[in-house]
Interface confidence: low
């Protein structure tokens, strides 16, 4: 997730004080839209166990952040699980990573003052064919 | 366990906190770690046994304006011969992120935090087989 240079057409009848870009600091409604969606990936699906590149989920908790709990995936194997249930090292389990935005209390411990923070999370794992480099 | 309200804290509120009108919070959208870059493995979306494509959704009234979504290319998974094996399933892996939504009501502008579910990629899973009694 990167810097967004956003411009929108302004209603011509509105006063000119409105910045066409997102201002640096905004007052935001405390109610988060869609806030009650399920945030525990263990409960939402069992893909982490059924995948050919299975992963474990680790709980990362930080009370100075919203959401305070984030689940991090760690691939169980270097290889992938084959049809016989064995690890096949001709294939690789690799993490799928995603940059997400969270809220960080700023100044620290303040209940209603936040700053957006970009963090990198491993969401799950996928099985890939390795890149093979042939010796010349 | 329910996620605590955004305003909830385990700490005493310090004296230096900025004043905030009731029912809202102050949000600085100058992103912490803005310039940190993630070094992604090359082309995993094509090398995966459950490959996926990416599309960008663009919304000028959302911050960030660009959100990338993945879509699995196949219902099944790609086997060692490069063919689709429908005895296995390609499934999406999803992650929640926060965005700021700008809303226009007449001449006034308000901002709302929103949770967005992003499909990050796909993984290959053994299907759940339901046996009929």
């Amino acid at each position: 997730i990167v810097k967004a240079g956003i411009t929108i057409p302004r209603n011509p009848g509105c006063p000119n004080s409105e910045d066409k870009n997102f201002p640096r600091t905004v007052m935001v409604n405390l109610n988060i839209h869609n806030r009650n969606t399920n945030t525990n990936p263990k409960r939402s699906s069992d893909y982490y166990n059924r995948s050919t590149s299975p992963w474990n989920l680790h709980r990362n908790e930080d009370p100075e952040r919203y959401p305070s709990v984030i689940w991090e995936a760690k691939c169980r194997h270097l290889g992938c699980i084959n049809a016989d249930g064995n690890v096949d090292y001709h294939m690789n389990s690799v993490p799928i990573q995603q940059e997400i935005l969270v809220l960080r209390r700023e100044p620290p411990h303040c209940p209603n003052s936040f700053r957006l923070e970009k963090i990198l999370v491993s969401v799950g794992c996928t099985c890939v064919t390795p890149i093979v480099h042939h010796v010349a | 366990r329910k996620i605590p309200k955004v305003g909830h804290t385990f700490f005493q509120k310090p004296e230096s906190c900025p004043p905030v009108p009731g029912g809202s919070m102050k949000l600085d959208i100058g992103i912490i770690n803005e310039n940190q870059r993630v070094s992604m493995s090359r082309n995993i979306e094509s090398r995966s046994t459950s490959p996926w494509n990416y599309t960008v959704t663009w919304d000028p009234n959302r911050y960030p304006s660009e959100v990338v979504q993945a879509q699995c290319r196949n219902l099944g998974c790609i086997n060692a011969q490069g063919k689709e094996d429908i005895s296995m399933n390609s499934v999406p892996i999803q992650q929640e992120t926060l965005v700021v939504r700008r809303k226009h009501q007449g001449c006034s502008v308000s901002f709302q935090l929103e949770k967005v579910l992003v499909t990050v990629g796909c993984t290959c899973v053994t299907p759940v087989i339901h046996h009929v009694q």
């Epitope: - | 070094s39 090359r42 990416y54 304006s65």
Partner: antibody, heavy 122, light 107 residues
Framework: QVQLVESGGGLVKPGGSLRLSCAAS????????MTWIRQAPGKGLEWISY????????YYADSVKGRFTISRDNAQNSLYLQMNSLRAEDTAVYYC???????????????WGQGTTVTVSS | AIQLTQSPSSLSASVGDRVTITCRAS??????LAWYQQKPGKAPKLLIY???SLESGVPSRLSGSGSGTDFTLTISSLQPEDFATYYC?????????FGGGTKVEIK
């Protein structure tokens, strides 16, 4: 095969303007971040600007911020660099290059054009 | 901005020699480093990314190593086509920066 062809370079006086173009072919242009990198005569490489696949996210090096504008036209498979208030130190070969990742930027560059020469001199 | 310092700035070597080029970052950049080769009058060519991953089509006599602040590009047995200038580039943070280059010349 992937091809990037720059054009629009030339001789310009200090304070003048120039618009560079980069025509892309052989890949889905709209899926890739693109960048401009320059190389002054006998010198090393300098990254100057970056644009995301949709054109919504843009970065500039401090040395060109406020003077150069990067843009793209995905329908035309073209990347542009509008250069204003040119200075002698902007004299360089300008390369357009493709980011190595699909939609997600990796910020390293797997395909480069042959370059176009910009000379700023009175 | 992160500074990248390459050493040596130039070196002379013979075909078959083992050549090592170093790149030092002014702050930790994890493994977010790429190496490029440039021949006179040509555009740079990506050789290595993520500090040690070989780009497709690049001969395996080239290898990269390192993480944090110290990185190395090694050519195990120098070939005639390897005489060129080599640049490192960090992609850990903006602004993206390149090293000053190392020119590999024929002895």
């Amino acid at each position: 095969q992937v091809q990037l062809v720059e054009s629009g370079g030339g001789l310009v006086k200090p304070g003048g303007s120039l618009r560079l173009s980069c025509a892309a072919s052989g890949f889905t242009f709209s899926n890739y971040y693109m960048t401009w990198i320059r190389q002054a005569p006998g010198k090393g490489l300098e990254w100057i600007s970056y644009i995301s696949s949709t054109g919504g996210n843009i970065y500039y090096a401090d040395s060109v911020k406020g003077r150069f504008t990067i843009s793209r036209d995905n329908a035309q498979n073209s990347l542009y660099l509008q250069m204003n208030s040119l200075r002698a130190e902007d004299t360089a070969v300008y390369y357009c290059a493709r980011d190595g990742g699909v939609i997600i930027s990796t910020a390293m560059f797997d395909y480069w054009g042959q370059g176009t020469t910009v000379t700023v001199s009175s | 901005a992160i500074q990248l310092t390459q050493s040596p700035s130039s070196l002379s070597a013979s075909v078959g020699d083992r050549v090592t080029i170093t790149c030092r970052a002014s702050q930790g950049i994890s493994s977010a480093l790429a190496w490029y080769q440039q021949k006179p009058g040509k555009a740079p060519k990506l050789l290595i990314y993520d500090a040690s991953s070989l780009e497709s089509g690049v001969p395996s006599r080239l290898s990269g190593s390192g993480s944090g602040t110290d990185f190395t590009l090694t050519i195990s047995s120098l070939q005639p086509e390897d005489f060129a200038t080599y640049y490192c580039q960090q992609f850990n943070s903006y602004p993206l920066t390149f090293g000053g280059g190392t020119k590999v010349e024929i002895k």
